[in-house]
């Protein structure tokens, strides 16, 4: 056929966000005389992308010199592509007319898809700390990627996790997508130094996945263990009792000594010993003047850790036989409201 044909050789083109997209279009004839235009979409809702005749299209450049004699190449390049540029582009030939040019022929259309990198994954943990053996949830979010296909994995200390749920939104085609994943992690006492990692793989990342991390130290509370013991006597009328507070995390700790239920001294943990697993130890001591007591004394070490309900351990100091340096210890949780956190 001699009649002009509009040839768009590519049915589809895929471009990375930020790059330029070349949309090819060629005419088979110089006749009829008239301009070409590029549109995104068709029909009543179409959007003008380029008009050879008039207008300002700062992101569009022509691949060849359109004013050149005998030019049949009407390909365009669109710079700085964003996901919002995705769609089907039509190269349309107009016939010169008066007063207006008349549409004459359209190309078959080229579908432009945009490859956009996902944003750096943001991992967030629970709002409140949990104790070992409990399950906490971590979320991972990344946005702005295209195409929709994406892979997300969770790791804890390098070991892949399986208990997680992932959603990619929206469900249908869109200019760009978001991913949201929630992983469930069971805490152990040794997790103070542990880390969870959300790893995202996408075609735009060329095999170099993005990672977001969260430290379990911000999610875990390891409650202390208490041990009250009597130390060897320094003087005949003095008993030295110590309270060993072990393996707690985080650091915040307030300790109160009670003699027969009456507050003797309150102190805040300052010089702590850090263990290899990230937990802390602390020791407090109490000197009891045995001359001041006729009867046995119950000494209680009460610890409030990280704003939680106080736990305590008691020790019965036998005054009548204090020279024997022995007593008995009693453990209980204090059924009183915790003191205000420091």
């Amino acid at each position: 056929e001699d009649e002009l044909q509009v040839i768009q050789p590519e049915k589809s083109v895929s471009v990375a966000a930020g790059e330029s997209a070349t949309l090819r279009c060629a005419m088979t004839s110089l006749i009829p005389v008239g301009p070409i235009m590029w549109f995104r979409g068709a029909g009543a809702g179409r959007e003008l992308i380029y008009n050879q005749k008039e207008g300002h299209f700062p992101r569009v450049t022509t691949v060849s010199e359109l004013t050149k004699r005998n030019n049949l190449d009407f390909s365009i390049s669109i710079s700085n592509i964003t996901p919002a540029d995705a769609g089907t582009y039509y190269c349309v030939k107009f016939r010169k007319g008066s007063p207006d040019d008349v549409e004459f022929k359209s190309g078959a259309g080229t579908e432009l898809s945009v490859r956009a990198k996902p944003s750096a994954p943001v991992v967030s943990g629970p709002a409140v700390r949990a104790t070992p053996e409990h399950t906490v949830s971590f979320t991972c979010e990344s946005h702005g990627f295209s195409p929709r296909d994406i892979t997300l994995k969770w790791f804890k200390n390098g070991n892949e996790l399986s208990d997680f749920q992932t959603n990619v939104d929206p469900a249908g085609d869109s200019v760009s997508y978001s991913i949201h994943s929630t992983a469930r992690v069971v805490l152990t006492r040794g997790d103070v130094h542990s880390q969870v990692i959300c790893e995202i793989a996408h075609i735009t990342l060329q095999g170099d996945p993005l990672r977001g991390t969260a430290n379990l130290s911000e999610a875990i509370r390891v409650p202390p263990t208490l041990e009250v013991t009597q130390q060897p006597m320094r003087a005949e009328n003095q008993a030295n009792v110590t309270c060993q507070v072990s393996n707690f995390y985080p650091r915040g700790l307030q300790l109160t000594w009670l003699e027969n239920g009456n507050v003797s001294r309150t102190e805040t943990a300052s010089t702590l010993i850090e263990n290899k697993d990230g937990t802390y130890n602390w020791m407090s001591w109490l000197l009891v003047n045995t001359c001041a007591h006729r009867d046995d004394v119950v000494l209680t070490c009460q610890v409030e850790h990280d704003g939680q309900q106080a736990v305590s351990k008691s020790y019965a100091l036998e005054i009548s036989a204090h020279q024997k340096e022995h007593g008995s210890d009693i453990t209980h949780e204090a059924a009183l409201a915790p003191t205000a956190p420091l």
Epitope: G41, A42, G43, A44, G45, R46, A86, G87, T88, Y90, V92, V102, E103, F104, K105, S106, G107, A108, G109, E111, P170, A171, G172, D173, S174, V175
Partner: antibody, heavy 123, light 106 residues
């Protein structure tokens, strides 16, 4: 492959309501707009309107405003046409038809059609 | 916009060249599609943008025209082409179809 499968024929009395379904498969349902087209026996085709399957927003042609409603069940990849207060003039075959353009463009031509649902309104 | 297909019926013979016309009541550019519909079946897209053959459509089907006058040509009529043919404009809302042209054997 891409398919639009419509519900079976309906026999209704004047004044009743009918709801026709169009189940889509073979593509991402919320990608492409869905139009509805009416064809009375022995007559031509009339575009009734369309529903944007991504936003759920529907547009009715002026001749089909009032008694006609388009809806979606996205999880079931299904579009619906509901006609209230049926009259004899509603006797026709109703087609669902899918648009060629993704990304929310307005409807243009229709490369994919359902097999049609015949609605007969008779006292 | 009214799409007028003035020929309600057209008689033809196998291997004949057939031209079906469609006239728009106002300028629709090239925003025209053509469909084929066989008895008891749903319409099938043949042409879009006035002259672009849809995927899988035999090349004996050709569309032409712009503005207000459009033509669908079947260059080598086959028995399987006996059907109703509808034009449709998508230049403005509401989308409108022609009343159809029925092809029959002489």
């Amino acid at each position: 492959q891409i398919q639009l499968v419509q519900s079976g024929p309906e026999l209704k009395k004047p004044g009743e309501t009918v709801k026709i379904s169009c189940r889509a498969s073979g593509y991402t349902f919320t990608t492409y707009g869905m139009s509805w087209v009416k064809q009375a026996p022995g007559k031509g085709l009339r575009w009734m309107g369309w529903i944007n399957t991504y936003s759920g927003v529907s547009t009715c042609a002026d001749d089909f405003k009032g008694r006609f409603a388009f809806s979606l069940e996205t999880s079931a990849t299904t579009a619906y046409l509901q006609i209230h207060n049926l009259t004899n003039e509603d006797t026709a075959t109703y087609f669902c038809a899918r648009d060629p353009h993704s990304y929310g463009n307005s409807p243009a031509w229709f490369p994919y059609w359902g097999q049609g649902t015949l609605v007969t309104v008779s006292a | 916009i009214v799409m007028t297909q003035s020929q309600k019926f057209m008689s033809t013979t196998i291997r004949d060249r057939v031209s079906i016309t469609c006239k728009a009541s106002q300028n629709v550019g090239i925003s025209v599609a053509w469909y084929q519909q066989k008895s008891g079946q749903s319409p099938k897209l043949l042409i879009y943008s006035a002259s672009n053959r849809y995927t899988g459509v035999p090349d004996r089907f050709t569309g032409s025209g712009s503005g207000t006058d459009f033509t669908l040509t079947i260059s080598n009529m086959q028995s399987e082409d006996l059907a109703d043919y509808f034009c449709q404009q998508y230049s403005s809302y509401p989308l409108t179809f022609g009343s159809g042209t029925k092809l029959a054997i002489k």
